[in-house]
């Protein structure tokens, strides 16, 4: 009778449970970046360090030429912190020379490519102005969510310039997925 | 024949499980800062409510000191947010003065300490140039990412000036942490 | 002999597990917004795509109304970012002027309502001063942090103003939760 | 106990200058945010200027800003105020009065406070 | 700048009598507001912070209430050492401004 009552709760239960510490997840920071062809009208994607430092990649969640490669279907909450740094934007050197005001702006886009798609997804943006006064400006943009991503999907961090990125500690610039 | 077949895939799935509801967990607001000795060049810790309002702390996971006590090993996501605000800043007196712009800035650090390792490792930082012309300002720098914590690290939050810091409102300024 | 090793840890470690497949979590994005006459003194309710696109609700976490409603007690994480947009600052305009300088704001709070309790709870906020000399600024700000929240309880997002919230694209603007 | 005493004031004629001091005991002064608070004859409090504990942030108010410069040596308790191009307005009861950790809070003692006349 | 604005600016009283002073704020301050009492000659002295916490050493007979814009600050039975001039202060935006004051004096 025992046996009856605890059967049916088990298999209604147990069955698609899975451990919380073999799911794929990913913490990868910044390193200086190599120059490469970009793309026209395309913004470059970063580089970075998997292994060293806080870097690390478990449970078949891989990094490889840029991208995160997603081992298996699911719910995953993707984030990354970029930082900024720049000498006075243009913005306020063509305010100052008394022509219109353009500001300069920075951008961090999180994008999903899947193989089976021509188009890649912009799944996160973080845009911002910058039009600052001050002769030496920096600042993050950090970007989270979540996403419903299949297995193959891969991930890559873009950012408008490349050459503004903060590449000088492992806390300022990262990136990082996990499975919920 | 049926219990053969289960037994295994049983032991195989299900050794490490464990309920959510008992993952070590936090989420701390913040207080008005009391008066400390601060060390020179090391940024001062705040300090932060643990019980009334939104936080909470809860198995295991204890908050004592400015620090939020790692329970057990594993992979945590961590986050904060700290809201400053100022006057006017420096930077934009001295642009007026006619004197080279020297930007404020304004940064955030999550840091872990390891007993057994002298240094403290800088986990996140969140660093920005303020350079303001309205006679106040007020802005939030927020940090989140996932990260590989063993049983005894210790978490807190650095500022780089604990003066600016907005202690009004809970929702503004507040630091946390769960076990993924 | 081995039924009896095995039963006891059975119960004690499996009772309140569950799968983490089906658990509540939703994303949602931003849309044009309808207007809506708005409560004098309270900051208007975004509302939001919750099926198209990269939206989506699962696992009886409803979208309603401009609310999501927590369909179990637990600990959610829920974030939120919004971009805004808009012309020179009325802060630059006025110190153009020689007036006071009076910076605008812009402001994002993540409020729960729960229908017991009579006044909404302001979970997450994030304000920021814009004081901006460029002709066009834009900005993102960001939000998330852990809650624990009861069934019942409503989620809604609310902005300093509405009319600067940039809806034209899905990854600039953008409110999830998910059962942790 | 807490003790906060301004010296430095007196009459002094318009456009000229003059150094106020508040001597401070009983409290690690290098702990706390400080201010400058006036008080015209026979007006209401009026708030002048803050430095932070440390001495990395000023602020001022908009009628002296420019003109009067906050300062503090925490290796000797005090605080000070510069002030120059005073004007008539400028006449009041001077105090400085301690504050908390963060540069905007409340003024939990007082000195008792220093004259400034300015006058021709 | 908030503008904090009191009422009365006068109010005449007898001993024992219970005392109600008004602070309005041009805008809200949440519960970041103090109170300060002032005797002719003499520097200020705190009373009350955040709206509602009565400072050490200050007799309980004084009490602050109020959040966002409306604060009272209420002395239950007055006493001699009472008759002064209050002022209530926001500290919830820069600059810090101080209401016109309210003397309390003897009827």
């Known amino acids: 009778l025992k046996g009856q009552e605890f059967a049916p709760s088990h298999q209604q239960v147990y069955a698609p449970l899975r451990a919380d510490g073999d799911k794929p997840r990913a913490h990868l920071t910044v390193v200086r970046q190599t120059p490469t062809q970009h793309l026209k009208n395309q913004f470059p994607a970063l580089h970075w360090e998997h292994e060293l430092g806080l870097a690390f990649t478990k449970n078949r969640m891989n990094y490889t030429n840029k991208f995160l490669l997603i081992p298996e279907s699911g719910d995953y909450f993707v984030y990354s912190q970029v930082t900024f740094r720049g000498m006075t934007s243009e913005c306020s050197e063509i305010r100052q020379a008394g022509r219109p005001n353009k500001p300069d702006s920075i951008t961090v886009v999180i994008t999903k490519v899947t193989d089976s798609y021509p188009e890649p997804t912009q799944l996160l943006m973080g845009t911002k102005s910058v039009c600052e006064v001050g002769s030496n400006w920096f600042q993050p943009i950090y970007l989270g969510a979540m996403f419903s991503l299949q297995e193959g999907d891969k991930l890559m961090v873009n950012v408008s310039d490349i050459s503004l990125v903060d590449y000088t500690k492992e806390d300022k610039t990262f990136f990082g997925a996990f499975l919920l | 024949l049926k219990g053969q077949e289960f037994a295994p895939s049983h032991q195989q799935v299900y050794a490490p499980l464990r309920a959510d509801g008992d993952k070590p967990r936090a989420h701390l607001t913040v207080v008005r800062q009391t008066p400390t000795q601060h060390l020179k060049n090391q940024f001062p810790a705040l300090h932060w409510e643990h019980e009334l309002g939104l936080a909470f702390t809860k198995n295991r996971m204890n908050y004592t000191n400015k620090f939020l006590l790692i329970p057990e090993s594993g992979d945590y996501f961590v986050y904060s947010q700290v809201t400053f605000r100022g006057m006017t800043s420096e930077c934009s007196e001295i642009r007026q003065a006619g004197r080279p712009n020297k930007p404020d800035s304004i940064t955030v650090v999550i840091t872990k300490v390891t007993d057994s390792y002298p240094e403290p490792t800088q986990l996140l930082m969140g660093t920005k140039s303020v350079c303001e012309v309205g006679s106040n300002w007020f802005q939030p720098i927020y940090l989140g990412a996932m990260f590989s914590l063993q049983e005894g690290d210790k978490l807190m939050v650095n500022v780089s000036d604990i003066s600016l810091v907005d202690y009004t409102k809970e929702d503004k300024t507040f630091f946390g942490a769960f076990l993924l | 002999l081995k039924g009896q090793e095995f039963a006891p840890s059975h119960q004690q470690v499996y009772a309140p597990l569950r799968a983490d497949g089906d658990k509540p979590r939703a994303h949602l994005t931003v849309v044009r917004q309808t207007p809506t006459q708005h409560l004098k003194n309270q900051f208007p309710a975004l509302h939001w795509e919750h099926e198209l696109g990269l939206a989506f609700t699962k696992n009886r976490m409803n979208y309603t109304n401009k609310f999501l409603l927590i369909p179990e007690s637990g600990d959610y994480f829920v974030y939120s970012q919004v971009t805004f947009r808009g012309m020179t600052s009325e802060c630059s305009e006025i110190r153009q002027a020689g007036r006071p300088n009076k910076p605008d704001s812009i402001t994002v709070v993540i409020t729960k309502v729960t229908d017991s309790y009579p006044e909404p709870t302001q979970l997450l906020m994030g304000t920021k001063s814009v004081c901006e000399v460029g002709s066009n600024w834009f900005q993102p700000i960001y939000l998330g942090a852990m809650f624990s929240l009861q069934e019942g309880d409503k989620l809604m997002v609310n902005v300093s103003d509405i009319s600067l919230v940039d809806y034209t694209k899905e990854d600039k603007t953008f409110f999830g939760a998910f059962l942790l | 106990q807490v003790q906060l005493v301004e010296s430095g004031g007196g009459v002094v004629q318009p456009g000229r200058s003059l150094r106020l001091s508040c001597a401070a005991s009983?409290?690690?002064?290098?702990?706390?945010?400080m201010h400058w608070v006036r008080q015209a004859p026979g007006k209401g409090l009026e708030w002048v200027a803050v430095?932070?504990?440390?001495?990395?942030?000023?602020y001022y108010a908009d009628s002296v800003k420019g003109r009067f410069t906050i300062s503090r040596d925490n290796s000797k308790n005090t605080l000070y105020l510069q002030m120059n191009s005073l004007r008539a307005e400028d006449t009041a009861v001077y105090y400085c009065a301690r504050g908390q950790v963060a540069i905007l809070d409340y003024f939990d003692y007082w000195g008792q406070g220093t004259l400034v006349t300015v006058s021709s | 700048d908030i503008q904090m604005t009191q009422s009365p600016s006068t109010l005449s009283a007898s001993v024992g009598d219970r005392v109600t002073i008004t602070c309005r704020a041009s805008q809200s301050i949440s519960s970041w507001l103090a109170w300060y009492q002032q005797k002719p000659g003499k520097a200020p002295k705190l009373l009350i912070y955040d709206a509602s916490s009565l400072e050490s050493g200050v007799p309980s007979r004084f009490s602050g209430s109020g959040s966002g814009t409306e604060f009272t600050l209420t002395i239950s039975s007055l006493q001699p050492d009472d008759f002064a001039t209050y002022y209530c202060q926001q500290y919830n935006s820069y600059p810090p401004t101080f209401g016109g004051g309210t003397k309390v004096e003897i009827k």
């Open positions: 009983g409290f690690t002064f290098s702990s706390y945010a």
């Open positions: 430095i932070s504990y440390d001495g990395s942030n000023k």
